[in-house]
């Protein structure tokens, strides 16, 4: 039967819930599907039921709330029907789900060398997601960096921060490195998707030699 | 019974700080959400702050963010806002209320329980 | 911000009279309005909450009602203890938003 696989709100404002909606070999042929939903501000279950405001904004087997239908203070109830009958149900705060788009515009500066030229420190740079509307303050993200060389599998995670920048220490010079970021909503919801990958190629040895080398 | 009771009111020169406390009984603050209200002298009522200590989220009107703290102690049932760069304007009663959660994902539309005040009065 | 515009500001009224109080929310907020009593000195009282269900404890002459975005309180009966001003407020956007209030007076 079709089951929520999940639901999700970028920044608070808005939210968008997905569905299976696999035909199982041997299941009798479901009528369509259809997403009803109730904000639960009673305590009763009597309460109005209506149905899914926006079938096509978040894609296939998807409802979307937009900030007309979405608010965060009284948690809401939804449900999946077919042919009359309740296939799926399941209740939560708009808290509860948020989980921010990736962070944007990853950049790097060198901040130093050792004095052997073999590791470098970097500054890794970064932009909350557009629509995270941080500058409004219903959004206090926090983010995790990861980075790792390019030829190992294991990403090397760094403690979360509140900041859109952090110094990475001790990288091998002239290797190559893979950093990504990802954000959540600060003591609530889950971590967004990873941002692009940011590669950092740090120069050779001699591209870092000072001029007191040659006296 | 339930009750709230602020404290932590005073004057205070502009630029100053001060942290007022809304003491909570008769509920577990981990399963409610806290308001702070404020009104000024002769005014209406303006909404200052939330958290929800369950979900750890908390939201600001514009006029106070950056400068306003809220926070909660869950294990002293207290909810604090901590208030810096205090300005003549923020001169009011401040209020903390609640907003009920109750069982399976229901929540009031509405403050049920208010303290009973606590004046800050910010003048040089 | 949903601005909740409250009217009248002020009324005076008679012991026995029916008094009416209305809210426009300059968008729609669903039926997330609460009405507040305030007397001086004192924390406001919950009378009203999701528009149109009477807190508990609050006496059956007053209401709430919805029109669209036009929400009404409505005292069917004065009573001397209802001298106080009444606030709407609504709980649907952020910030949260409270008209302006509305004092009634003795006539």
């Known amino acids: 039967e079709p089951k929520f696989t999940k639901c999700r709100s970028p920044e608070r404002e808005t939210f968008s819930c997905h569905w299976t909606d696999e035909v199982h070999h041997g299941t009798k042929n479901l009528g369509p599907i259809q997403l009803f939903y109730t904000r639960r501000n009673t305590q009763e279950w009597t309460q109005e039921w209506k149905e899914c405001p926006d079938y096509v904004s978040a894609g296939e087997n998807s409802c979307y709330f937009n900030s007309s239908f979405t608010s965060i203070w009284i948690p809401y109830c939804i449900k999946l029907t077919s042919n009359g009958g309740t296939v799926d149900e399941k209740c939560f705060s708009v808290d509860e789900i948020v989980q921010p788009d990736p962070p944007i515009a990853l950049n790097w500066t060198l901040l130093n060398v050792s004095l052997t030229g073999i590791h470098a420190d970097i500054q890794v740079r970064w932009e909350a997601p557009r629509n995270a509307d941080i500058q409004k303050g219903w959004m206090v993200l926090e983010y995790e960096l990861q980075y790792k060389e390019v030829n190992e599998t294991k990403w090397k995670m760094m403690d979360p921060i509140l900041t859109t920048s952090v110094p990475v220490y001790s990288l091998k010079v002239d290797k190559e490195y893979e950093v990504r970021v990802r954000s959540k909503q600060r003591n609530s919801g889950n971590y967004g998707e990873f941002s692009e990958v940011l590669y950092v190629t740090l120069p050779q040895m001699s591209q870092f030699t000072c001029e007191e080398d040659f006296y | 019974e339930v009750q709230l009771v602020e404290s932590g009111g005073g004057l205070v020169q502009p630029g100053g700080s001060l942290r007022l406390s809304c003491a909570a009984s008769?509920?577990?603050?981990?399963?409610?959400?806290i308001h702070w209200v404020r009104q000024a002298p002769g005014k209406g009522l303006e909404w200052v702050a939330y958290?929800?200590?369950?979900?750890?989220?908390?939201y600001y009107a514009d006029s106070v963010k950056g400068r306003f703290t809220i926070s909660a102690d869950t294990s002293k049932n207290t909810a604090y806002l901590q208030m810096n760069s205090l300005r003549a304007e923020d001169t009011a009663v401040y209020y903390c209320?609640?907003?009920?959660?109750?069982?399976?994902?229901?929540?009031?539309?509405?403050?049920?329980?208010w303290g009973q005040g606590t004046l800050v009065t910010v003048s040089s | 911000d949903i601005q909740m515009t409250q009217s009248p500001s002020s009324l005076s009224a008679s012991v026995g009279d029916r008094v009416t109080i209305t809210c426009r929310a300059s968008?729609?907020?669903?039926?997330?309005v609460a009405w507040y009593q305030q007397k001086p000195g004192k924390a406001p009282k919950l009378l009203i909450y999701s528009a149109s269900s009477l807190y508990s404890g609050v006496p059956s002459r007053f209401s709430g009602s919805r029109s669209g975005t036009d929400f009404t309180l409505t005292i069917s009966s004065l009573q001397p203890e209802d001298f106080a001003t009444y606030y709407c407020q609504q709980f649907w956007g952020t910030p949260i938003t409270f008209g302006q209030g509305t004092k009634v007076e003795i006539k």
């Open positions: 968008q729609s907020v669903s039926s997330a």
């Open positions: 958290i929800s200590s369950s979900y750890g989220s908390t």
């Open positions: 209320a609640r907003q009920y959660y109750g069982y399976h994902y229901y929540a009031q539309e509405a403050f049920d329980y």
């Open positions: 008769g509920f577990n603050l981990y399963s409610s959400s």
